[in-house]
Structure formats: structure tokens, C-alpha cells
């Protein structure tokens, strides 16, 4: 049945530490002006802080942060024709990551 | 000005592929009747399909899913003292992931 | 369609404390900056803050650092602004604004705005 | 930090003229220069970026230009939804600063 699965492993946390993520790169940061073109590619991995803090008061944080431009192609269709040209993007990379108290309200004295 | 950088290198694609993500444990997973306790972890690593493919159509899917039971802590706040109990959450984990074509919406006839 | 929609403004004491939130819908949230603009009555746009896409990254105005904490969660797509140690002169409309990538520093699409007013 | 001065602060004008507003930076900007659109009520609006780039969606009747520190906002042929107040904003540094703003009233 469904509901028959393996023994159930004691849960770990996932720690705050940098990860592998998938940025997408929208055509509207390399040209706002029109959309008529294609972005080549489509999506680049970035390194990014993520996981948990051991309470709601704490946050997973960035502390060192490098920021990577790369080259895209922008592929103009102009007469049903590609055009290449090139585009920089630039991705923000997490280096290292800390759980960080979270800014909240002062109380008012 | 606020854009000058190092010297661009040419963007690589986030292949579809799985990577390491983050999967919170909210609380109604554990008890959609009262909100009165907490769960530890808050969080887990699960493997999860991510990237993206050549053209629009298609779209970085699962091809091999595995159901993953983990084992949590449901901490109840009675009388302001703590009562340990434990639970059982079902995570999904991707296995193998592949560029298929999405369903498009069909023609009325 | 891109949509921004500020919530959180109100009426509160100076010295007080406000949480702004913008719920973005529409667009890659987690791939642009993000900023907050406001607009005192009858006056023109003074910038407040802007944060990377990744949120690793944040600028202030002068006139509010220190006091004010910009922040992001992409999971919900939502922006925020923690406000502290209110005074009178922040009384105004404040917008959220998509703000592109790195080099751009623009406000490309604008939320309606929230109103704070700062008084006792 | 750099001030950018808007001129005129408000003018007249009919539907169908040619209306041309100038924004001053302090220092050069290069041509890391965005105008908006105001109108009473209402959030403002990207018309132009990086001084002379439209904004996709936005009439062709709208042009920018200049470089440096001089900069012009150009309405070819003035509509009647275009009466509202315009801002320019330098994105060369922090922070980043607007102009006063021009307010376009009906003659």
C-alpha cells in the first residue's frame, strides 16, 4: 500500500551554509525595452546561503557575498533571422553564511 | 559607477539535474489541529530536479521519485513545560530528472 | 503581469516601530533587486533602500540607516521593510519598486504604496 | 552625493505641442539617467533608462537624451493623459537621488 514505507531515520537539520541554486536569467535584465529576443542560457547556478537557525528569532544569512559577472547571448530575431549579440549579467555569489538575529521591532521606552 | 566589475566569463547553463535544496517542516504537517508546539528540525535537505532546458517547451521534470520518511520532534508547550513526541514526516526525493515536453493545453473541438 | 502590493503602513508614535511587506507576483522575483521609494505629502521621491536578488547585498539612505532594515524572502516572494526609531519626517507613502539587476539601479515596476504617518 | 536639478518645475502646454523637460546632475552620470511618470493618486511609472532606452509599453511619442550631465525628457506630441508630474533619477551612485520633478499642467 501506499502508506508502507522503510523505517523512519531520526531527521537532521539542514544547516545554514552556502548552496547550489538555480538563478534564471530574465530577458527584462538585459533589455527592457523590447522582448522580441531569446537569452542564451536560460538559467546559471549561483551559490546561496540557505537552511535553518536553531529558533524564529535567527536567520540564515549571507556574511561574505562576490558578486560574478558572466556573458549571455542575446539572440535578436530581426526578419526571422538570429542576430547575436552579447549581454552581461551579474550573480550574486554567497561565500559564507551565519545565523544572524533578525532585525526586529525596538520596544519604545 | 555602481556597474563596473571584473571581466565577464561566458555564462554556463544549470543543467537540468538535481541539486541539494531546502525543505521546511511547517507545522501543519505535523498537526493541522492546534498550532500549540514546535517541530524540530525546522528543516531538511531533500534532493530536488532543477535547471533548465533548451527551449521553452519543455521544462526539467522528475523522472524517478523516492518517498523519504524522517522521523521529528513535536515539541507541545503544556502548562509552559515541554512534552516531547515524536512524528512522522514523508519527503519526496527526486532521483533522475529529464527535459520533457510540457503539456500544452489541448485545442477545443 | 508584474504586480507589487505594499501592506503594514499605518498610524503609529514616533519612537514607534512598522514592519512594511510587498508581495511580488508576476515576474522571477529571486532574480531582481528590489528597493523601497517613498514620497512624503505633496513632496517629490526620496530613495530609502535597495537589496540584492540574493539579499546579500543592501543600500541605505542617510536619512534612515541605522533605523531601518531592508530584507527579502524569495521562498514567498516577498520583500521588507523594518522600521525603528520612527520620526515625524517619515511620515509618507512608501512604494516597493523592482529595481533590475546590478547595474541597473532603476525602478521599473512600482507597487501602489502604503501609507505611514508618524505622529502622536 | 549627487543632486539632480529638474527645470521647469511646472509648465503649460496644449494637447499637441512638443514639450521638453531638462534634468542637471551635480557631477557626470554618464548615461545612468531613468525618467517617471506621475500622476495624482498614483504610483510612478519607468518611461525611459540609461538616458535614452524606452521602457517596454511606453508610446514612442517619449524620448530621452544626453550624456554626462545634462539631460533631456522629450514629448514629441502631448497627449492628454500625459499631463502629470516627471522625475529624473541618477542610477550612477549611492544613493541614489531624484530630481524635484516638472509638473505638466493644461494650458
Known amino acids: 500500500s501506499l502508506g508502507s514505507l522503510t523505517v523512519a531515520e531520526p531527521a537532521m537539520i539542514a544547516e545554514c551554509k552556502t548552496r547550489t541554486e538555480v538563478f534564471e536569467i530574465s530577458r527584462r535584465l538585459i533589455d527592457r525595452t523590447n522582448a522580441n529576443f531569446l537569452v542564451w542560457p536560460p538559467c546559471v547556478e549561483v551559490q546561496r546561503c540557505s537552511g535553518c537557525c536553531n529558533n524564529r528569532n535567527v536567520q540564515c544569512r549571507p556574511t561574505q557575498v562576490q558578486l560574478r559577472p558572466v556573458q549571455v547571448r542575446k539572440i535578436e530575431i530581426v526578419r526571422k533571422k538570429p542576430i547575436f549579440k552579447k549581454a552581461t549579467v551579474t550573480l550574486e555569489d554567497h561565500l559564507a553564511c551565519k545565523c544572524e538575529t533578525v532585525a526586529a521591532a525596538r520596544p519604545v521606552t | 559607477s555602481l556597474g563596473s566589475l571584473t571581466v565577464a566569463e561566458p555564462a554556463m547553463i544549470a543543467e537540468c539535474k538535481t541539486r541539494t535544496e531546502v525543505f521546511e517542516i511547517s507545522r501543519r504537517l505535523i498537526d493541522r489541529t492546534n498550532a500549540n508546539f514546535l517541530v524540530w528540525p525546522p528543516c531538511v535537505e531533500v534532493q530536488r530536479c532543477s535547471g533548465c532546458c533548451n527551449n521553452r517547451n519543455v521544462q526539467c521534470r522528475p523522472t524517478q521519485v523516492q518517498l523519504r520518511p524522517v522521523q521529528v520532534r513535536k515539541i507541545e508547550i503544556v502548562r509552559k513545560k515541554p512534552i516531547f513526541k515524536k512524528a512522522t514526516v514523508t519527503l519526496e526525493d527526486h532521483l533522475a530528472c529529464k527535459c520533457e515536453t510540457v503539456a500544452a493545453a489541448r485545442p477545443v473541438t | 503581469e508584474v504586480q507589487l502590493v505594499e501592506s503594514g503602513g499605518g498610524l503609529v508614535q514616533p519612537g514607534g516601530s512598522l514592519r512594511l511587506s510587498c508581495a511580488a507576483s508576476?515576474?522571477?522575483?529571486?532574480?531582481?533587486?528590489m528597493s523601497w521609494v517613498r514620497q512624503a505629502p505633496e513632496k517629490g521621491l526620496e530613495w530609502v533602500s535597495t537589496i540584492s536578488d540574493g539579499g546579500g547585498l543592501t543600500y541605505y539612505a542617510d536619512s534612515v540607516k541605522g533605523r531601518f532594515t531592508i530584507s527579502r524572502d524569495n521562498a514567498k516572494n516577498s520583500l521588507y521593510l523594518q522600521m525603528n526609531s520612527l520620526r515625524a519626517e517619515d511620515t509618507a507613502v512608501y512604494y516597493c519598486a523592482e529595481s533590475g539587476g546590478y547595474t541597473d539601479w532603476l525602478f521599473g515596476y512600482w507597487g501602489q504604496g502604503t501609507l505611514v504617518t508618524v505622529s502622536s | 552625493d549627487i543632486q539632480m536639478t529638474q527645470s521647469p518645475s511646472s509648465l503649460s502646454a496644449s494637447v499637441g505641442d512638443r514639450v521638453a523637460i531638462t534634468c542637471r546632475a551635480s557631477?557626470?552620470?554618464?548615461?545612468?539617467l531613468n525618467w517617471y511618470q506621475q500622476k495624482p493618486g498614483k504610483a510612478p511609472k519607468l518611461l525611459i533608462y540609461?538616458?535614452?532606452s524606452l521602457q517596454s509599453g511606453v508610446p514612442s511619442r517619449f524620448s530621452g537624451s544626453g550624456s554626462g550631465t545634462d539631460f533631456t525628457l522629450t514629448i514629441s506630441s502631448l497627449q492628454p493623459e500625459d499631463f502629470a508630474t516627471y522625475y529624473c533619477?541618477?542610477?550612477?551612485?549611492?544613493?541614489?537621488?531624484f530630481g524635484g520633478g516638472t509638473k505638466v499642467e493644461i494650458k
Open positions: 533619477q541618477q542610477s550612477y551612485s549611492t544613493p541614489l537621488t
Open positions: 540609461a538616458a535614452s
Open positions: 508576476g515576474f522571477t522575483f529571486s532574480s531582481y533587486w
Open positions: 557631477q557626470s552620470i554618464s548615461n545612468y
